[in-house]
Amino acid sequence: GPNICTTRGVSSCQQCLAVSPMCAWCSDEALPLGSPRCDLKENLLKDNCAPESIEFPVSEARVLEDRPLSDKGSGDSSQVTQVSPQRIALRLRPDDSKNFSIQVRQVEDYPVDIYYLMDLSYSMKDDLWSIQNLGTKLATQMRKLTSNLRIGFGAFVDKPVSPYMYISPPEALENPCYDMKTTCLPMFGYKHVLTLTDQVTRFNEEVKKQSVSRNRDAPEGGFDAIMQATVCDEKIGWRNDASHLLVFTTDAKTHIALDGRLAGIVQPNDGQCHVGSDNHYSASTTMDYPSLGLMTEKLSQKNINLIFAVTENVVNLYQNYSELIPGTTVGVLSMDSSNVLQLIVDAYGKIRSKVELEVRDLPEELSLSFNATCLNNEVIPGLKSCMGLKIGDTVSFSIEAKVRGCPQEKEKSFTIKPVGFKDSLIVQVTFDCDCACQAQAEPNSHRCNNGNGTFECGVCRCGPGWLGSQCECSEEDYRPSQQDECSPREGQPVCSQRGECLCGQCVCHSSDFGKITGKYCECDDFSCVRYKGEMCSGHGQCSCGDCLCDSDWTGYYCNCTTRTDTCMSSNGLLCSGRGKCECGSCVCIQPGSYGDTCEKCPTCPDACTFKKECVECKKFDRGALHDENTCNRYCRDEIESVKELKDTGKDAVNCTYKNEDDCVVRFQYYEDSSGKSILYVVEEPECPKGPD
């Protein structure tokens, strides 16, 4: 019977393949008259089309390179493999999709490079003193995680030009602390002090040699320094086969792109290395601060994880920055930097506990959708990251690549890589839009009315001015008797009133709105449903009245996302395990649960069990969450110590549990009207009396 392949009025093999991935073309010259050449493959076989004459390319994926994943990161670093496979080739026919998968492993004992980038403005004087022995302490702590550590050091203040620096009295140029009756270094933009080295005592020695400077305005020029520390890989000494941590410490806000105009600097940051032989940033006074976008691009290119170690007063600002820069973590630095060691170790733990995929150079005609298999072999649709991992864990992602239409260029490649990893998967795509039979085309063929067309794939492709199955009809020979071949049924309008009937064939009108196609001009690419003013919600293509949704979108209007990352709660479960994810939003099913991810539920039976772990780690510094350095991620609650529990009404749940000392801990889980979660914990656990 009729199907999508037979009703679109296609006249060539290439057009047939573009109708739908289900369509096949028969180039057999002996195909019975009246049988459609474009049809489902099984129908063509039924119509006695010779199997070797059927064009039916199938989308395929094949692995080109697949070294197995490594267990250890030590040894010959060039042989360490954290991503498998390393290369695949896809062959996609128009509007089709193909699945492939990628595995990622956080290998044990992977080399680590830590570059400490410090704000040396005047307010950081006590911090400089605090980190004098950081090198050896860091090496001791990190030895538990890697046998191959290198550390380096760099410092920044701000652009040494007015209005960022003191220029009067003249003495302030050489000593910006002149008016404070003390001495400090002349101001500098960024200086590289110590190239990454495994001699950790060198770090201590170099830090001891440093002194602070002073700048005039509140924000610092730290982003200039981040950019240079990122792109000057040879200067810094970043190794190809190592985790790269860039620790950025400051107690102040930072200048960003366009702030340079205050000093008349209009040249945009070029993202290149400008650290000269004197190890100073030479373009500090001639080039603007970098934008967040440029920094993100370069950090990603160089596989660097940025750690913002910043004081309480600016932590919210840097938290916002970190959300815009993948692979970035934020820690609260004490006023004198005394906690920076723990902060680096925690940040490294956080980085290694997460795998997040990023895609580079994805062609616009392709869309990808991801499914993650993180822990417990549970497949999470729409997710391209895994959290809560331990070193040595392996996670996998299933990826569907879908092509829209047939791209002009028949070859494209893109890369999928975990943020901060050097390893990647290269995906090479060949768009298979042509038919093999096209290679045997006969131009000016005698089979097409003595040369009026090209005989290709079993049919004539007519030259200009000629129509008909054998190019036998000139456009000038308009014969009304053939009008009935231009409408599907008697009484129906000719060419759907959107074309001219010439030689028994519809020649569709051109339209400003789009393309009119089909045997009877019955199809177009502009008459689909609109949602919020956009056809197919802006998330799909209109094809003969139907929305063909991009990947990640579904529904009649393509207005429902299939992505689920917005439904992921902090405990790593979709909708906290209390609801289902529909169109990117949680629909809470468990009675009493609410919140964007159904995370709030004081009356749920599991509330006490889960919140108990938060009490253990937040109040008593122990328990399962404490070990994993995940307390702050999972427990957003405020903790208040109380002498005894009060009755706070029906929205409060009283909980008790026995801790590891066999003492009874009592606490109350309460959410106030603003949705803030508070845990009231009885100060003293009730412990059993010892024998008299």
Partner: antibody, heavy 119, light 107 residues
Framework: QVQLQQSGAELTKPGASVKISCKAT????????IEWVKQRPGHGLEWIGE????????KYNDKFKGKATFTADTSSNTAYMQLSSLTSEDSAVYSC????????????WGQGTSVTVSS | DIQMTQTTSSLSASLGDRVTISCRAS??????LNWYQQKPDGTVKLLIY???RLHSGVPSRFSGSGSGTDYSLTISNLEQEDIATYFC?????????FGGGTKLEIK
Amino acid sequence: QVQLQQSGAELTKPGASVKISCKATGYTFSSYWIEWVKQRPGHGLEWIGEILPGSGITKYNDKFKGKATFTADTSSNTAYMQLSSLTSEDSAVYSCARLISYYYAMDYWGQGTSVTVSS
Amino acid sequence: DIQMTQTTSSLSASLGDRVTISCRASQDISNYLNWYQQKPDGTVKLLIYYTSRLHSGVPSRFSGSGSGTDYSLTISNLEQEDIATYFCQQGNTLPPTFGGGTKLEIK
């Protein structure tokens, strides 16, 4: 139509370096991998490696690591191969070719550049 | 690496003959076999890819077949312009490797 035009023959001394160019026309240069192939009489064809001009990603045959270096300039649609520390073993004809990725077939070839290493 | 062997290094035939050139792989290459023609002046052209698909502009007298480890190129009606060396190449796994070539001459 697609064309790959290579630079002219090179005569060079042992220990020196040489840089061969391959200018592409007739297609979007950045989208297709460029392959480099070595041909010596009696040794057949050997794949040296490849570069994706748009992103600069390279892949080398283990045998040619440290010997060949690929670069590409998308503004001039030109791919380059530098051969270093030349010896008589490097005397050969070097060709660039465009790749159809899925089949790993090289559909268009440059005319070849002859490199002769002689003291 | 996969080894590609063209056992016949040279072959003589008359114009109009049907000529078959063979190529063997050291392991199964799943039909990812390509054929190239190198003319005496050194220019190289792709003839057939994926065992049997004709590259655009290649005359239909050229055809390819085979599977697993054994493949062949056939010229059904030899013409003067077909005088060249023919190479096979596997594209199944990296690195791609070539056969030693078969030189076709006129008797």
